[in-house]
Interface confidence: low
């Protein structure tokens, strides 16, 4: 049991070690983002951390080193044909980011982009639903919601509320990736 725990701890540490050493000053700027915009911002921030490139050709400047695949369990990589990492089963990863990994690093994916909106997104709805390209990617998606630890879900929800109501920084979002 201890060995199992320590190996997981090591895995988490290795994953965390992929995060950027430096975060640009702009990451401390408060941004307000609700619903679809919140998810876009989260993907923009997290996308650059996972892939070490500009997410959707937006403004991220973070770099990561390559050996991320080494610390991701092989069971996660469920399609060897595709170059991008299949991060499907990492808890807490936004649905959009999971979808996003399917199309390869080269495109950084259409699913990541937000072209439609739901103007009637109230706070309650936002707790269970986030929207992207008019694609609807629920907060871990309703069908998968119960598979995630309650605390993690609550934290995710609280962060979305915070970003929407009072604003949040990229640094804060990065800490959730």
């Amino acid at each position: 049991m201890l060995r199992w725990f320590l190996s997981h701890l090591l895995g988490v540490w290795l994953l965390l070690s992929q995060l950027p050493r430096e975060i640009p000053a702009t990451d401390d700027k408060k941004l307000k983002a609700c619903g679809r915009d919140y998810v876009r911002l989260q993907i923009e921030v997290c996308g650059s951390i996972w892939w070490g490139r500009k997410a959707g050709q937006l403004r991220e400047r973070r770099q990561i080193s390559e050996p991320l695949a080494e610390v991701v369990p092989s069971s996660i990589i469920n399609d060897p044909e595709i170059l991008s990492l299949m991060l499907q089963s990492i808890p807490g990863m936004p649905q959009e980011l999971r979808i996003a990994t399917r199309s390869g690093k080269e495109k950084l994916l259409r699913e990541l982009h937000f072209v439609l909106e739901d103007s009637n997104l109230n706070l309650e709805e936002m707790k269970k639903t986030f929207l992207n390209t008019q694609f609807e990617a629920e907060d871990k998606s309703l069908s998968k919601l119960d598979k995630h630890p309650r605390k993690k879900r609550d934290n995710y929800i609280k962060m979305s509320d915070k970003c929407c109501n009072v604003g949040c920084t990229r640094r804060e979002l990065a800490s959730r990736c």
């Epitope: 649905q95 979808i99 072209v115 909106e117 008019q134 694609f135 609807e136 990617a137 629920e138």
Partner: antibody
């Protein structure tokens, strides 16, 4: 790779019916809002109908020109969306595109309504 | 309904030129959340439309930075700073702020 493939187009007489299908792959279909858009020489691109996800109770929206005649539906288990078209008119002719959230578009299927 | 008026209908250019396409809406596309849902697409012959710009100015993944979008409220512009052969085709705007979603009539970008 994301794919949307329409089928079911063809030639139909005015007043007739036709059902279009769109098979999707490469993304989580059940979470997607799906739309039908058509292109005709007379009207250009024209939005026809939208069906939202189960989380949005599969709510549907229609263009005024097709309301009461066309029905959009989906089968999440088959990753497919459909457009049932009744009481077809000549002005319904065109290329019908299936689109996932206006980000993905299929290649389209040609519908010709003519006597 | 929001009527989308796009100009010009045809835009002859030389490679390397700048091209500018205008899209005007009959009503404001800005939503109460402050966002404006106006997208630009390119359709090449025999292909389905491809998304270039979403929410007025956000460049879609893989779209070169020669292509940019701007504007607000009812007036929007797509600019191509240095036209290349791959840019040729029909450009159109679409508003997805209000149901029914409506399209511009399209602008054909062609070689002079």
């Amino acid at each position: 790779e994301v794919k949307l493939e329409e089928s079911g187009g063809g030639l139909v007489q005015p007043g007739g019916s036709m059902k279009l299908s769109c098979a999707a792959s490469g993304f989580t279909f059940s979470d997607a809002w799906m739309d039908w858009v058509r292109r005709s020489p007379e009207k250009g691109l024209e939005w026809i109908a939208e069906i939202r996800s189960k989380a949005k109770n599969h709510i549907t929206y229609y263009a005024e020109s097709v309301k009461g005649r066309f029905t959009i539906s989906r089968d999440d288990s088959k990753s497919s969306v459909y457009l049932q078209m009744n009481s077809l008119r000549t002005e319904d002719s065109g290329i019908y595109y299936c689109t996932g959230g206006f980000a993905y578009w299929g290649q389209g299927t040609l519908v010709t309504v003519s006597a | 309904d929001a009527v989308m008026t796009q100009n010009p209908l045809s835009l002859p250019v030389s490679l390397g030129d700048q091209a500018s396409i205008s899209c005007r809406s009959s009503q404001s596309l800005e939503k109460s959340n402050g966002n404006t849902y106006l997208n630009w697409y390119l359709q090449k012959p025999g292909q389905s439309p491809q998304l270039l710009i979403y929410r007025v100015s956000n460049r879609f993944s893989g779209v070169p930075d020669r292509i940019s979008g701007g504007g607000s409220g009812t007036d929007f512009t797509l600019k191509i700073s240095r036209v290349e052969a791959e840019d040729l085709g029909v450009y159109f705007c679409v508003q997805v702020s209000h149901v029914p979603f409506t399209f511009g009539s399209g602008t054909k970008l062609e070689i002079k």
